[in-house]
């Protein structure tokens, strides 16, 4: 019979024949032959392979180094790598999450649009007219100006993006 030019899923072509790939969590020791099956071996502790493969070496688990602000989000297994995230108040510097930086604070005049997570930084937005923020914070949104009218008061000092309005008593009309 003609030697195959393509193989089924979870197989690979070697020496004109189709061999079974090793399952996730195992590495290749020897290719199959006419008479023997593919020989695979489990990955060692703290190693993994996450696909059907013909790798001769397993990959090492990622180390979530606490000195870099990292912590384990998901423990590694023979079939999956360790997933790292950042300690509270920090976020990853890249998608691979190899180190962490402190969450950014929004300056006065800006409020938090989106609170930071372990993988994304704080998103700030300028306080629009009618809102203010007088603190530097990683959590505070822009606050609406105080409504003097609802308190039967009048605006004595206009608000800005950094300060609230100042309310005062209405001037009594003289007789």
């Amino acid at each position: 019979p003609e030697p195959p030019t393509a193989c089924r899923e979870k197989q690979y072509l070697i020496n004109s024949q189709c061999c079974s790939l090793c399952q996730p969590g195992q590495k290749l020791v020897s290719d199959c032959t006419e008479f023997t099956e593919t020989e695979c071996l489990p990955c060692g502790e703290s190693e993994f392979l996450d696909t059907w493969n013909r790798e001769t070496h397993c990959h090492q688990h990622k180390y979530c180094d606490p000195n870099l602000g990292l912590r384990v989000q998901q423990k590694g297994t023979s079939e999956t790598d360790t997933i790292c995230t950042c300690e509270e108040g920090w976020h990853c510097t890249s998608e691979a999450c190899e180190s962490c930086v402190l969450h950014r604070s929004c300056s006065p005049g800006f409020g938090v649009k989106q609170i930071a997570t372990g993988v994304s930084d704080t998103i700030c937005e300028p306080c629009p007219v009618g809102f203010f923020s007088n603190v530097s914070s990683a959590f505070e949104k822009c606050h609406p100006w105080t409504s003097c009218e609802t308190k039967d008061l009048v605006v004595q000092q206009a608000g800005t993006n950094k300060t609230d309005v100042v309310c005062g008593p209405q001037d009594r009309l003289r007789a």
């Epitope: 969590g25 060692g44 502790e45 703290s46 996450d50 384990v72 998901q74 023979s78 079939e79």
Partner: antibody, heavy 119, light 113 residues
């Protein structure tokens, strides 16, 4: 037969130090991750620390971070726990336990060694 | 940290009766890569160290009698002893094997009525 034998426990004064050992036999020690887990008298289990088979990865519980150091000597089939700045709340039976690369669970435990921190 | 909550704290059951205990985790123990729940059960008999009973929620460790079974997923798990034997008197601990720090439940003590 897999055997894990802890030693080094005893009475220590608060602020003192102690080094625990765990002698492993009956398996290829260098192929396994290892843990220390403790159990205060009459209480439940508390994980303390982990070290990977090749010494590359080490994790600690927050309660012992900066005070305890886990290490291993694969040539001597031994696991260690160096305990410094000991506190009364560290009083417990300390177990070493093995973690394999398949289950990723603690599949064998030693008998434990008792550390008592008291003045 | 993941908090493991076991219930009940203790239970007394007649020999041959069915025993059910529960374990709840404060977050999912499902590994997104291999779709296994990393929930482990350990048995600790009086005066002895813990012994691995069940891993990956429902896989019995070699040598563990088939009267022991585990079930559940995500955050809710159950250990069942189908017919209690005298040698099953112990404290049973569930454990988060999903992430560090590894955390244990406070245990469920099983006694004979």
């Amino acid at each position: 037969e897999v055997q894990l034998v802890e030693s080094g426990g005893g009475l220590v004064k608060p602020g003192g130090s102690r080094r625990l050992s765990c002698a492993a036999s009956g398996f290829t020690f260098s192929d396994y991750g290892m843990h220390w887990v403790r159990q205060a008298p009459g209480k439940g289990l508390e994980w303390v620390a982990y070290i990977s088979s090749g010494n590359r990865i080490i994790y600690y519980a927050d309660t012992v971070k900066g005070r305890f150091t886990i290490s291993r000597d694969n040539a001597k089939n031994s696991l260690y726990l160096q305990m410094n700045s000991l506190r009364a709340e560290d009083t417990a039976l300390y177990y070493c336990a093995r973690q394999d690369g398949y289950r990723y669970a603690m599949d064998y435990w030693g008998q434990g060694t008792l550390v008592t921190v008291s003045s | 940290d993941i908090v493991m909550t076991q219930s009940p704290d203790s239970l007394a059951v007649s020999l041959g009766e069915k025993v059910t205990m529960n374990c709840k985790s404060s977050q999912s123990l499902l590994n997104s890569g291999n779709q296994k729940n990393y929930l482990t059960w350990h048995q600790q008999k009086p005066g002895q160290p813990p012994k691995l009973l069940i891993y990956w929620t429902s896989t019995r460790e070699s040598g563990v009698p088939d009267r022991f079974s585990g079930s559940g997923s995500g955050t809710d798990f159950t250990l069942t002893i189908s017919s209690l034997q005298a040698e099953d008197v112990a404290v049973y601990y569930c454990q988060n094997d999903y992430t560090y720090p590894l955390t244990f439940g406070a245990g469920t003590k099983v006694e004979i009525k």
